[in-house]
Amino acid sequence: DWVVAPISVPENGKGPFPQRLNQLKSNKDRDTKIFYSITGPGADSPPEGVFAVEKETGWLLLNKPLDREEIAKYELFGHAVSENGASVEDPMNISIIVTDQNDHKPKFTQDTFRGSVLEGVLPGTSVMQVTATDEDDAIYTYNGVVAYSIHSQEPKDPHDLMFTIHRSTGTISVISSGLDREKVPEYTLTIQATDMDGDGSTTTAVAVVEILDANDNAPMFEPQKYEAWVPENEVGHEVQRLTVTDLDVPNSPAWRATYHIVGGDDGDHFTITTHPETNQGVLTTKKGLDFEAQDQHTLYVEVTNEAPFAVKLPTATATVVVHVKDVNEAPVFVPPSKVVEVQEGIPTGEPVCVYTAEDPDKENQKISYRILRDPAGWLAMDPDSGQVTAVGTLDREDEQFVRNNIYEVMVLAMDNGSPPTTGTGTLLLTLIDVNDHGPVPEPRQITICNQSPVRQVLNITDKDLSPHTSPFQAQLTDDSDIYWTAEVNEEGDTVVLSLKKFLKQDTYDVHLSLSDHGNKEQLTVIRATVCDCHGHVETCPGPWKGGSGGGGSGAGVIAVIVVVVIAIVAGIVVLVISRKKRMAKYEKAEIKEMGEMHRELNA
């Protein structure tokens, strides 16, 4: 039948490998040649190749020793197909159960277990639990069943059976009375764990049982009076270490000290903590002390333990006299950050503000001032009076130095103490806008058709703030209004430039004057390229002599150089020639316009 009973394979097999386990056999092999295969983890999926099957014979083989502690059971599928690959049987479950061998010793979870119990406790008191694990099977065999025992106890006082261990749980408990910390503060037990429920392999570990002290000794100050000197203003400064002695177990809650300031610190200037190693009380400043306000503090410190006293005990108190040492304190600007409104462009030498500092010290120390950081170099500061004046032109529109209308300056005050100390202040100048910028059109170069031209919309920008901005006004100058019109839109923030008369294809200067709401005027020359075309245009079509062509030849480069030279010469000539000469281009354009009209009429 096409069924295989679960196959049991002992772990750690010695081989040799491949080792035969079972033969898969289909009774369909009478009719046709059968080919066998297996699938599943351990065959064709990880861990691959542990098991294999001979294709023609159906023999199931084991290729390596198994480890039950790694994989305890393999679930494979056996397949049978005919020569043409057609399945002749349903996949068959093959269960391979790895049977356990006692190949692991018990292992304690720790080399050394630590537990504690109060001195004088009654027998039966639980101390601690130890644990040993064994990777072997503890369900179907005793291979992994662990039994605990105590092998030895040191010291053997008052006798050698002070503790017992539960055979199966590993719980150690007190079995005899007489635990006395003053005589024996610690016991060392050698414990054993044995598998096969006590009949197999043994491993050992150590259990250290600390006998805890009852808190029957109060900590005592040694000495009881302290005197300390502390510089003023320092936070976190160690004032004094207070030492105590305690007869209880070192580093136990009954020995560890807890300190409290019980008097003399009405201003909450001090704090006291316990040093984790020395158990001293470390008195430190929580706030800076002020010599000018109080030059001496007398503190009262009380000490107790972390653990409450087991019996009624007197609490020790120490006195600490703290002398405050005077320190030269830094001048302090008032306020630390000063905001001043000042108009941009004020004349050089004009006062901006007075910015001074105060010295916390009692002596009347002399304070001198200087500018520490003035990125644009616009200000000066009088060293004696703290008077800040303008030495450069304050420019609100200078984007390099001014952010959100604010110019930030850092100033320094220095006293004449020994050693001298310094303090800094921040001066924030809020620059008030002045109408010092005229409106400017964008772009300043346009290309336009000379037939059915499209209106050119230019944006108007003004660096100033309202009300020194829009609405803007536009006016054409230098006879540019003969051929062009300029109109500001309703919102007053764009100007529309239109060609109103025919001009031949060429480049022209359009003189546009823009003024803002505060009548600040700015003349801008718009470079207009007029093209022989209709409607909208980006660049002039056809052979255009006015610009540089796209040629890549040497001749083209020479031509460009020639044009540039001519342009420079022409520029010089333009500066010399009169307005009439400048109008010649427009007059020729008029003649050409009339010629065009004449041609159209003849046509």
């Epitope: 040799p16 190749g49 294999a52 001979e54 023609e56 083989l61 290729n63």
Partner: antibody, heavy 118, light 107 residues
């Protein structure tokens, strides 16, 4: 018909290396364990190495462990034996043999001669 | 290492005669034993696997058996092609080990 044919045998100096090949045909090579066996000049047969069908696991006697490596290429239906640190006692006729019916040494090749001599 | 002691080391027999070869295992190997035949040209062939199972194509005059730790190969009636060397090999314990061989000659 199941056929195995060895090649690669040669004369090699002590300490040298050599790689033997065994080409298989006539059976599904990839599902059978394969071994190398050698026959010394005094006619004694000695098992040299075995490899599992998928090539994941290999086994050697102590006499060759660490010096010889058995491997296979199931795509090429070929078994290999890489021999290094050769000694004069490795002189033998080397045969490759397949498992069949879960049992070793079912089908044998003609053998290839390895001579280790200075 | 498990030892396979093969006897006799050589044997002369006549055609038609019944002969038996023996291998003794120094430890238990169960039924994990094969018998091999080597012809004078060096060709090796497996005759018997698992102590007593006959390989396909092997004449029925060959048979294998076991008695305790002794394993036998019997040829019921010798034929001319049966002459050559015969080896046992165990695979019940690692490493696999061979008998020293028996040379079967024509008398």
């Amino acid at each position: 018909v199941q056929l195995v044919e060895e090649s690669g045998g040669d004369l090699v100096k002590p300490g040298g290396s050599l790689k033997l090949s065994c080409a298989a045909s006539g059976f599904t090579f990839s599902t059978y364990g394969m071994s190398w066996v050698r026959q010394t000049p005094d006619k004694r047969l000695e098992w040299v190495a075995t490899i599992s069908s998928g090539g994941h696991y290999s086994y050697y006697p102590d006499s060759v462990k660490g010096r010889f490596t058995i491997s296979r290429d199931n795509a090429k239906n070929t078994l290999y034996l890489q021999m290094s640190s050769l000694k004069s006692e490795d002189t033998a006729m080397y045969y490759c043999a397949s498992y069949y019916y879960g049992s070793p040494f079912a089908y044998w090749g003609q053998g290839t001669t390895v001579t280790v001599s200075s | 290492e498990l030892q396979m002691t093969q006897s006799p080391s050589s044997l002369s027999a006549s055609l038609g005669e019944r002969v038996s070869l023996t291998c003794r295992a120094s430890q238990d190997i169960g039924s994990s034993l094969n018998w091999l035949q080597q012809k004078p040209d060096g060709t090796i062939k497996r005759l018997i696997y698992d102590t007593s199972s006959l390989d396909s194509g092997v004449p029925k005059r060959f048979s294998g058996s076991r008695s305790g730790s002794d394993y036998s190969l019997t040829i019921s009636s010798l034929e001319s092609e049966d002459f050559g060397d015969y080896y046992c090999v165990q695979y019940g314990s690692s490493p696999l080990t061979f008998g020293a061989g028996t040379k079967l000659e024509i008398k």
